[in-house]
């Protein structure tokens, strides 16, 4: 009976989310393997988040709006582990917008989701950021490593979206 009611609840939750995401990929987790955590297909998952790499070349603002329509934001990177996971799926000859910008050019960097910008947890390439006119951040591969660079916000780039996992 307990299992039946849990299944019914899950199905109704799945139907609710199906309006927004035609397909979800779910895995069982939790100490009793009774919780399901899901990401939209074909997003990838790491810890409590889902990630989508957009290969559409768009400006930073349009990229953020595009993520927003999908219930996400441009990616906020909190740890080296998270960055290492994300970069496994990136192409080394491409650049991807992050959810990091400095709209006034005052070198006051801010994350799209209002996460405090912590200078100690940043992965700028050597010598970056280097121009007050370059007010948006990308991640790219340079000098044998992945790192961040400041670029013009209006120049079209690929992008990475991030959203919280859906729990059912």
């Amino acid at each position: 009976n307990f299992m039946y009611s849990k299944t019914v609840k899950r199905l109704s939750k799945l139907q609710e989310y199906q309006q927004y995401y035609p397909s979800l990929t779910c895995v069982m987790e939790g100490k009793d393997m009774e919780d399901w955590s899901c990401c939209p297909t074909p997003w990838t998952s790491f810890q409590s988040s889902c990630y989508f790499i957009s290969t559409v070349m768009q400006s930073w603002t349009k990229s953020q709006n595009n993520c927003s329509v999908m219930g996400a934001d441009l990616v906020v990177i909190n740890t080296k582990e998270e960055q290492d996971f994300i970069t496994q799926n990136l192409k080394i000859n491409s650049a991807y917008f992050l959810g990091l910008s400095d709209p006034k050019g005052w070198r006051h960097w801010q994350w799209v989701d209002q996460t405090p910008y912590n200078k100690n947890v940043t992965f700028w390439h050597s010598g970056e950021p280097n121009s007050p006119d370059e007010r948006c951040a990308i991640i790219n591969f340079r000098s044998e490593e992945w790192g961040w660079n400041d670029v013009h916000c209006h120049v079209p780039q690929k992008s990475i979206c991030k959203m919280k996992k859906i729990y059912i």
Epitope: S59, D133, C153, H154, P156
Partner: antibody, heavy 121, light 111 residues
């Protein structure tokens, strides 16, 4: 006082080439992105090309891509536009303009007086 | 590319009257509190001159009778009382994404 002075315009046959120059003074040229904007007779404004302050980024509309090349010489405070394979539809007044970044975009705060390019046989 | 449509194409008014010029974008040129539309004035035989940046910010040296407003896709340039020197062509411009684009212009002429 900020000044932008274009030169190099003239009459050229279709398929010909011209090199426009823009001499900048009154500001630290190397700190600013620059653009060329043109205006065909009796028409509106059309952006032609952009170059970033450090020369790392250039951009062109499809209408001139592969034919026009923007460049700059920060030591000489000069902006250039090399125009090859010119067509009748390239006939216009060409302005150089200074870019000012504002939030996620930019605007043009100073413009030169323009130089006229006429493409005709 | 983002297409900017200005209306009306021509505005016939008398000195002292109020002028209201419209610019509509094919998609939003705003992001949160940033409204990324700019306005220029052009007189015959002259280069364009910046009037308004960021939808509502008056450029230094521009008279206070000029004002701008709007967000997302709809923007307005208002001249509260037309002076003889205000009769000219006005262009809107966006650069939130490349390529930067201009509207087709509104000519403000003497009635």
């Amino acid at each position: 006082e900020v000044q932008l002075v274009e030169s190099g315009g003239g009459l050229v046959k279709p398929g010909g080439s011209l090199r426009l120059s823009c001499a900048a003074s009154g500001f630290t040229f190397s700190s600013y992105g620059m653009s060329w904007v043109r205006q065909a007779p009796g028409k509106g404004l059309e952006w032609v090309s952009t170059i970033s302050s450090g020369d790392s980024y250039t951009y062109y509309p499809d209408s001139v891509k592969g034919r026009f090349t923007i460049s700059r010489d920060n030591a000489k405070n000069s902006l250039y536009l090399q125009m090859n394979s010119l067509r009748a539809e390239d006939t216009a007044v060409y302005y150089c303009a200074r870019q000012i970044y504002y939030d996620y975009a930019y605007y043009f705060d100073f413009w030169g007086q323009g130089t006229t390019v006429t493409v005709s046989s | 590319e983002i297409v900017l449509t200005q209306s009306p194409a021509t505005l016939s008014l008398s000195p002292g009257e109020r002028a209201t010029l419209s610019c509509r974008a094919s998609e939003s040129v705003s992001f949160r509190t940033s409204h990324l539309m700019h306005w220029y004035q052009q007189k015959p035989g002259q280069a364009p001159r910046l009037l308004i940046y960021g939808a509502s910010n008056l450029e230094s040296g521009i008279p206070a009778r000029f004002s701008g407003s709007g967000s997302e896709t709809d923007f307005t340039l208002t001249i509260s009382r037309l002076e003889p020197e205000d009769f000219a062509v006005y262009f809107c411009q966006q650069s939130i994404e490349d390529p930067p684009t201009f509207g087709g212009g509104t000519k403000v002429e003497i009635k």
